[in-house]
């Protein structure tokens, strides 16, 4: 089936926005005014995954770029990366597992759990201007809660 997608931005629970930091990395920092235009717009695609009544599988691509967030092992540690794909073949309903995140809504906040690495989440640091990463703890120092803002196509 044709994949259903929507455009959105994400902010962590401390209201930090996500921006590009070099060609293959995202960082989180507070933005205001015109600087808000720097934040990345995601194309969130609703894909096949181990869907449950409270987890919705999605893929997170960067709008109008052939880049997707993916989860891989680097030095034996689950790691978040931006991966380049062939735009002719993506997005698709049946994404490879490394591209899939379980979107979990709790108390109007969103978590994004890696399908490839259960209990690992898209995370940001408390500190400003630090990379977005895959974290293996919830409820600690690092932030795993986000809000989503819809962006018109």
């Amino acid at each position: 089936a044709p994949v259903r997608s929507l455009n959105c931005t994400l902010r962590d629970s401390q209201q930090k926005s996500l921006v590009m930091s070099g060609p293959y990395e995202l960082k989180a920092l507070h933005l205001q005014g015109q600087d808000m235009e720097q934040q990345v717009v995601f194309s969130m695609s609703f894909v096949q995954g181990e869907e449950s009544n409270d987890k919705i599988p999605v893929a997170l691509g960067l709008k109008e770029k052939n880049l997707y967030l993916s989860c891989v092992l680097k030095d034996d540690k689950p790691t978040l990366q931006l991966e380049s794909v062939d735009p002719k073949n993506y997005p698709k309903k049946k994404m490879e597992k490394r591209f899939v995140f379980n979107k979990i809504e709790i108390n109007n906040k969103l978590e994004f759990e890696s399908a490839q690495f259960p209990n690992w989440y898209i995370s940001t640091s408390q500190a400003e201007n630090m990379p977005v990463f895959l974290g293996g703890t919830k409820g600690g120092q690092d932030i795993t809660d986000f809000t989503m803002q819809f962006v018109s196509s």
Partner: antibody, heavy 122, light 107 residues
Framework: EVQLQESGPGLVKPSETLSLTCTVS????????VSWIRQPPGKGLEWLGL???????YYNSPLKSRLTISKDNSKSQVSLKLSSVTAADTAVYYC????????????????WGQGTLVTVSS | DTQVTQSPSSLSASVGDRVTITCITS??????MNWYQQKPGKPPKLLIS???TLRPGVPSRFSSSGSGTDFTFTISSLQPEDFATYYC?????????FGQGTKLEIK
């Protein structure tokens, strides 16, 4: 060889809880999802829900409030509990293995148990 | 939820006949349609999985075609052991949904 076998009481009283067990062999429950399906006598197939390898569950909306699916990977068993049953829950209940092939066929079901008839009657 | 409409609900045919069953879905499911055969007192048996893929050991007289919303299941030359009930199942999205079934009887 992949096998699934349903077991449980054949008779349940109205308003009680129907409990069934699916014992599997030939594959690991931590790697593959298992669905439950039922078929009332002389009627078609209804998909009830599933439990994934990681333990997450998806329940079909009409039964969501009454249905619980759980599993014990070490015993290779998946269980179904359906509460507050009525005569309309009389059916043959099947468990089936999900193909769980990421990026290809995640939701299809390939192997089924023989089924067990559950009658709801006082 | 994706609704699946299967037709006909019953069908009388003779050995050697060519038989066709159709399933129409309420949403585009790409090629994610599966076809099962069920005999009385037995569980459904998967004949054709998504992508119109014949399962190992299933005779080549069984075939399917279609994508999107319109799907066809064909038995090219009916054999005595083919008289059974056939179901389609969409596996594109949850909840999984079956067609209502087609009972194939001897004419």
């Amino acid at each position: 060889e992949v096998q699934l076998q349903e077991s449980g009481p054949g008779l349940v009283k109205p308003s009680e809880t129907l409990s069934l067990t699916c014992t599997v062999s030939g594959f690991s429950l931590s790697d593959y999802g298992v669905s439950w399906i039922r078929q009332p006598p002389g009627k078609g197939l209804e998909w009830l829900g599933l439990i994934w390898g990681g333990g997450d569950t998806y329940y079909n909306s009409p039964l969501k409030s009454r249905l619980t699916i759980s599993k014990d990977n070490s015993k290779s068993q998946v269980s179904l509990k359906l509460s507050s049953v009525t005569a309309a829950d009389t059916a043959v209940y099947y468990c089936a293995k999900q193909r769980t092939l990421w990026g290809y066929d995640l939701y299809g079901m390939d192997y089924w148990g023989q089924g067990t008839l559950v009658t709801v009657s006082s | 939820d994706t609704q699946v409409t299967q037709s006909p609900s019953s069908l009388s045919a003779s050995v050697g006949d060519r038989v066709t069953i159709t399933c129409i879905t309420s949403t585009d499911i790409d090629v994610d349609m599966n076809w099962y055969q069920q005999k009385p007192g037995k569980p459904p048996k998967l004949l054709i999985s998504q992508g119109n893929t014949l399962r190992p050991g299933v005779p080549s007289r069984f075939s399917s075609s279609g994508s999107g919303t319109d799907f066809t299941f064909t038995i090219s030359s009916l054999q005595p052991e083919d008289f059974a009930t056939y179901y389609c199942l969409q596996s594109d999205n949850l909840p999984l949904t079956f067609g209502q079934g087609t009972k194939l009887e001897i004419k």
